[in-house]
């Protein structure tokens, strides 16, 4: 089953994705796809990174977080109700049938019409992140027995909107991260 | 302010082992990677390796692979290094040195924002 | 491995004068390329990350610039604090990185 995600047309929307090199600099390739995980690869890719770089990405898509430490969470920029559907995230650690699959749903909500603004909502307008709430939900564990000291967590649900990429390690460990090594 | 505390200096014989640590202090400690750093008596600065105190995995400088082993305690966040088999080579101010906030995908690698104050390490028989 | 070459090995000033220590890389390593004073039996001190961006806490009188495969680090009017040596370190081969021979700033 899928995470749910949503986002106003306009915003820009996160999707969450973490996982943690086994040492430093050793960074397993990742995909992004529009459309459900297949069984090989993303579909329909909108951005990928190999062992280094982000090698390929499509406009609108990209990685906010520092992808070198592990936070691949993907930022869709200025949505529009058509973005609307199921995304992959694909670790793709080596190994025949190794890689961790996400699947998570994002909803386009239609933008908001806000009545004339007062000097409060000015305030919230310049800041809207101080009104963002974070939920942390459950984690479910499962370790590869073909790959030595790989742990998997599968991720779960992380708030909308989460930028700044420090919060990937206050996720992780609360559960909400894969570990390699 | 974040700090990095290390380890006294040693006089160590010919073929001994040597481990010292490096104490961080007033930061998030597995939040940051933790590299070190050799500086030979009047000379530059060699890196040695970095690690990454959330999980213990290190990266090593290919001339000290075998030589240098990383590990860190999380609970007391401490990074300590140990060098094996020292020689008069091996003499030397060995420092701890975090990485520095990450800063944009634009750019690679980070730079060392906070150094300890350096373990001394003298070998001598 | 990436190469970083630093001139001159040594630079004699009076305080008060501006100077320009230079960083040259063997190969591009774009503005991946960070700057560090040592004092006399002290540790580094970051004074610049990623060729030009300033650090908190240091003084406005040192400066960055560069791209590429040749930098420099700027000290306007030197001021007798500013003595020791300047180290530049690459990170372009995260997370392996290199570091200069050094340039010792030494009063005239």
């Known amino acids: 089953s899928e995470v749910e995600y949503r986002a106003e047309v306009g915003q820009n929307a996160y999707l969450p994705c973490f996982y943690t090199p086994a040492a430093p600099g050793n960074l397993v390739p990742v995909c992004w796809g529009k459309g459900a995980c297949p069984v090989f690869e993303c579909g329909n890719v909108v951005l990928r990174t190999d062992e280094r770089d982000v090698n390929y990405w499509t406009s609108r898509y990209w990685l906010n977080g520092d992808f070198r430490k592990g936070d691949v969470s993907l930022t869709i920029e200025n949505v529009t109700l058509a973005d609307s559907g199921i995304y992959c995230c694909r670790i793709q650690i080596p190994g025949i049938m190794n890689d961790e699959k996400f699947n998570l749903k994002l909803v386009i909500k239609p933008a908001k019409v806000t009545p004339a603004p007062t000097r409060q909502r000015d305030f919230t307008a310049a800041f809207p992140r101080m009104l963002t709430t974070r939920g942390h939900g459950p984690a479910e564990t499962q370790t590869l027995g073909s790959l030595p000291d790989i742990n998997l967590t599968q991720i779960s649900t992380l708030a909308n909107e989460l930028r700044d990429s420090r919060l990937a390690n206050d996720l992780r460990d609360s559960g909400a991260t894969i570990r390699i090594g | 302010e974040v700090q990095l505390h290390q380890s006294g200096p040693v006089l160590v014989k010919p073929g001994a082992s040597v481990k010292m640590s490096c104490k961080a202090s007033e930061y998030t400690f597995a939040d940051y990677y933790m590299n070190w750093v050799k500086q030979s008596h009047g000379k530059s600065l060699e890196w040695i390796g970095v690690?990454?105190?959330?999980?213990?995995?290190?990266t090593y400088n290919q001339k000290f692979k075998g030589k240098a082993t990383l590990t860190v305690d999380k609970s007391s966040s401490t990074a300590y290094m140990e060098f094996s088999s020292l020689t008069s080579e091996d003499s030397a101010v060995y420092y701890c040195?975090?990485?520095?906030?990450?800063?944009?995908?634009?750019?690679?690698?980070?730079?060392?924002?906070?150094w300890g104050q350096g373990t001394s390490v003298t070998v001598s028989s | 491995d990436i190469v970083l070459t630093q001139s001159p090995a040594t630079l004699s000033v009076t305080p008060g004068d501006s100077v320009s220590l230079s960083c040259r890389a063997s190969?591009?390593?774009?503005?991946?390329l960070h700057w560090y004073q040592q004092k006399s039996h002290e540790s580094p001190r970051l004074l610049i990350k990623?060729?030009?961006q300033s650090i908190s806490g240091i003084p406005s009188r040192f400066s960055g610039s560069g791209s590429g495969t040749d930098f420099s680090l700027s000290i306007n009017s030197v001021e007798t604090e500013d003595f020791g040596i300047y180290f530049c370190q690459q990170s372009h081969t995260w997370p392996q990185y290199t570091f200069g021979g050094g340039t010792k700033l030494e009063i005239k």
């Open positions: 040195a975090r990485d520095a906030d990450f800063y944009g995908n634009s750019y690679v690698g980070y730079a060392m924002d906070y």
């Open positions: 990623y060729a030009s």
């Open positions: 190969q591009s390593i774009n503005t991946d």
């Open positions: 690690i990454n105190p959330y999980n213990g995995g290190a």
